[in-house]
Interface confidence: medium
């Protein structure tokens, strides 16, 4: 499977809400011995590879923001914690998963990475990520709502397998 990012750039005004989205394409293993883990984190455009560094989003680490399987939160405390920070991660059964950030500030600008790990117990781990940029703007040049820029076909598939 691979992860695509429908939009590579989100330009949003301060105070607005933004939902960043990733999509899993292709077959994902199913069964008792398979765990699908999804999460989000901030990163930087590394020289070697995008999304290698993992930084917190609003002080929440990628561990705090993770989802298991088809969107079941691993722990309610994690979910509550995210909501207290104006964040919510969600997942559907069509391969889409997202993070919603409420009341954006300039500090939210950065490179956001979604991570999917397929754990085939007793066998291997397959890791894939996608990246997108969020620019939060203020002042007269800021858009009234979020403006999204579609990924080019090349950029939309950020594949890293482990």
């Amino acid at each position: 499977f691979k992860v695509t990012t429908p939009y590579s750039l989100y330009v949003c005004p301060e105070g607005q809400n933004a939902t960043l989205t990733c999509r899993i394409l292709g077959p994902v293993s199913k069964g008792h011995d398979v765990t699908i883990y999804k999460t989000w984190y901030l990163s930087s455009r590394g020289e070697v590879q995008m999304c290698s560094e993992r930084r917190p989003i609003r002080n929440l680490t990628f561990q705090d923001l993770h989802l298991h399987h088809g969107g079941h939160q691993a722990a309610n405390t994690s979910h509550d914690l995210a909501q207290r920070h104006g964040l919510e991660s969600a997942s559907d059964h069509h391969g889409n998963f997202s993070i919603t950030m409420r009341n954006l500030t300039l500090l939210d600008s950065g490179l956001y990475c979604c991570l999917v790990v397929e754990i085939r117990h007793h066998h291997s781990e397959h890791r894939v990520h996608g990246a997108m940029e969020l620019q939060v703007q203020t002042g007269k040049d800021a858009p009234s709502n979020c403006v999204v820029y579609p990924s080019s076909s090349q950029d939309s598939e950020n594949i890293t397998a482990a």
Partner: antibody, heavy 118, light 106 residues
């Protein structure tokens, strides 16, 4: 503060079994896998296996299947490893360590020393 | 299983000296992880995903590599860096560690 507190040292007789505990605090227990690692003078570090408190799923190093049994008690945020039919080769320090999926073992217990001797 | 071979097994360095140790994998792995262990203590995570420093790790440590060849470098050796260093892979089961490089201070 993240902590993994393991049970104390053990001196056991050959053929006996024993259980080591690892009490987790300071983080969401179900958001990580709990891994167990053996350290002996002969083999350095060896990964024994992991358990996911989220769903109880386990993965073992084939070498330790039948030797180690991993369980968790979610209510007390405690992971356990039972070691069966002990021999002198099982004398070692055993560590528990938490791991987030797609990451590394970022916090370790202090280790439990097990000595098998008659 | 993937065998990780570390070299050298033992090395010594003077304060301020640059130190490099290597980890060779029997099959290709996607990422390498490095741990530091001092006598009487538990292992401590140093490097994740080949080249990223774990929280609280001094900037003099760095990691690099790909495929079957990886390395850990200390730009300027300090007395507190004397320890045993282990590489580890999570790419395929069973997860394995290298045999360790013991770094001593001259």
């Amino acid at each position: 503060e993240v902590q993994l507190q393991q049970s104390g040292p053990e001196l056991v007789k050959p053929g006996a079994s024993m259980k080591i505990s690892c009490k987790a605090s300071g983080f969401s227990f179900t958001g990580y896998t709990m891994n167990w690692v053996k350290q002996s003078h002969v083999k350095n570090l060896e990964w024994i296996g992991l358990i996911s408190p989220y769903n109880g799923g386990t993965s073992y190093n084939q070498k330790f299947k039948g030797k180690a049994t991993l369980t968790v008690d979610k209510s007390s945020s405690t992971a356990y490893m039972e070691l069966l039919s002990l021999t002198s080769e099982d004398s070692a320090v055993y560590y528990c360590a938490r791991r987030a999926y797609g990451y590394a073992m970022d916090y370790w217990g202090q280790g439990t020393s097990v000595t098998v001797s008659s | 299983q993937i065998v990780l071979t570390q070299s050298p097994a033992i090395m010594s360095a003077s304060p301020g000296e640059k130190v490099t140790m290597t980890c060779s994998a029997s099959s290709s792995v996607s990422y390498m992880y490095w741990y530091q262990q001092k006598p009487g203590s538990s292992p401590r995570l140093l490097i994740y995903d080949t080249s990223n420093l774990a929280s609280g790790v001094p900037l003099r440590f760095s990691g690099s590599g790909s495929g079957t060849s990886y390395s850990l470098t200390i730009s300027r050796m300090e007395a507190e860096d004397a320890a045993t260093y282990y590489c580890q892979q999570w790419s395929s089961y069973p997860f394995t560690f290298g045999s360790g490089t013991k770094l001593e201070i001259k």
